[in-house]
């Protein structure tokens, strides 16, 4: 039975040209995290594997940095980065947990972070 929950940074906004940290946290389970995939709308951004470490997709190497922790840092943001991001936690023995973050990249300097929320 899957008892865990994924807490994410929720809906967030950031300025064009700036950086943002995408962060998920798995709680309420003793399952072992074997791998975390970071995806953007059917596109692989990065993978963090417990044994192999980080792999950043070649097309994002210049703008994506691993961490902090199992999170992901997006740099040099453009308006095209606006959209949904997913953290997929592969765990043993529970299976897969998925968290969702919506990022809006703003032209203006009025960029506020949304509240944290939980996905069961």
């Amino acid at each position: 039975m899957m008892t865990g929950t994924i807490e994410t940074t929720g809906n967030i906004s950031a300025e064009k040209g700036g950086s943002i940290i995408l962060q998920c946290h798995l709680s309420s389970t003793t399952a072992q995290v074997t791998q975390v995939n970071w995806e953007q709308q059917d596109q692989l951004l990065a993978i963090c594997n417990a044994d192999l470490g980080w792999h950043i997709s070649p097309s994002f190497k210049d703008r994506v940095a691993p961490g902090p922790g199992l999170g992901l840092t997006l740099q040099s943001l453009t308006v095209n980065d606006t959209g949904e991001y997913f953290c997929i936690y592969h765990t043993y023995p529970d299976g897969t947990y998925t968290g969702r973050i919506f990022l809006e990249v703003l032209e203006s300097s009025v960029a506020e972070h949304g509240a944290r929320f939980q996905i069961p």
């Epitope: 192999l52 792999h55 097309s59």
Partner: antibody
């Protein structure tokens, strides 16, 4: 340099058994899931089996389930495929393959030919 | 099981041509699609992984695109060493499945 070297192929009669081995070098063997993929003469590629880095999880194609057993000895950096109750349709070149992040096959062995015939 | 359908099964092309091979999955596989090149008597070689990522050491004339169910491998300018058979493969779920292959021959 990553190397995967298969051995153990050969001619066997229907109903017989073979054990294939794949000796790995050049990487941290127990960090990677490993797979077997086969290719019948003149045909396409067919996935056969997979095993996690620790050996704790195994997966099989329906066509070999109950007849083939995948295993690994991480102390020897070696992958195995025990093949029992072999059939003519198991005739193929068998490749062992390394699969990082469970997404793609980045290295293949050179293959070993298994021929099942009377 | 997820079925992978490749087209065409074979094609004839000349050096310098732009070549496009398509692969269709029987259900959505997100980006879990890889492309391999195989030459006679040799093991397959990884070209593109995760739909669009170019494997290290592979020439930039190879590119991949698509997500969900429809994927494309493109060779922008065919070179003599590119005449081979190309396979797509899904890693979304087990059993892993391959397309039937596309043989690229010299016109």
């Amino acid at each position: 340099e990553v190397q995967l070297l298969e051995s153990g192929g050969g001619l066997v009669q229907p109903g017989g058994s073979l054990r294939l081995s794949c000796a790995a070098s050049g990487f941290t063997f127990d960090s990677y899931s490993m797979h077997w993929v086969r290719q019948a003469p003149g045909k396409g590629l067919e996935w056969v089996s997979a095993i996690s880095g620790s050996g704790g999880s195994t997966y099989y194609a329906d066509s070999v389930k109950g007849r083939f057993t995948i295993s690994r000895d991480n102390s020897k950096n070696t992958l195995y495929l025990q093949m029992n109750s072999l059939r003519a349709e198991d005739t193929a070149v068998y490749y062992c393959a390394r699969v990082p992040y469970s997404v793609w096959i980045d290295y293949w062995g050179q293959g070993t030919l298994v021929t099942v015939s009377s | 099981d997820i079925q992978m359908t490749q087209s065409p099964s074979s094609l004839s092309a000349s050096v310098g041509d732009r070549v496009t091979i398509t692969c269709r999955a029987s259900q959505s596989i997100s980006y879990y699609l890889n492309w391999y090149q195989q030459k006679p008597g040799k093991a397959p070689k990884l070209l593109i992984y995760a739909a669009s990522s170019l494997q290290s050491g592979v020439p930039s004339r190879f590119s991949g695109s698509g997500s969900g169910t429809d994927f494309t491998l493109t060779i922008s300018s065919l070179q003599p060493e590119d005449f081979a058979t190309y396979y797509c493969q899904q890693s979304y779920s087990t059993p892993l499945t391959f397309g039937g292959g596309t043989k690229v021959e010299i016109k």
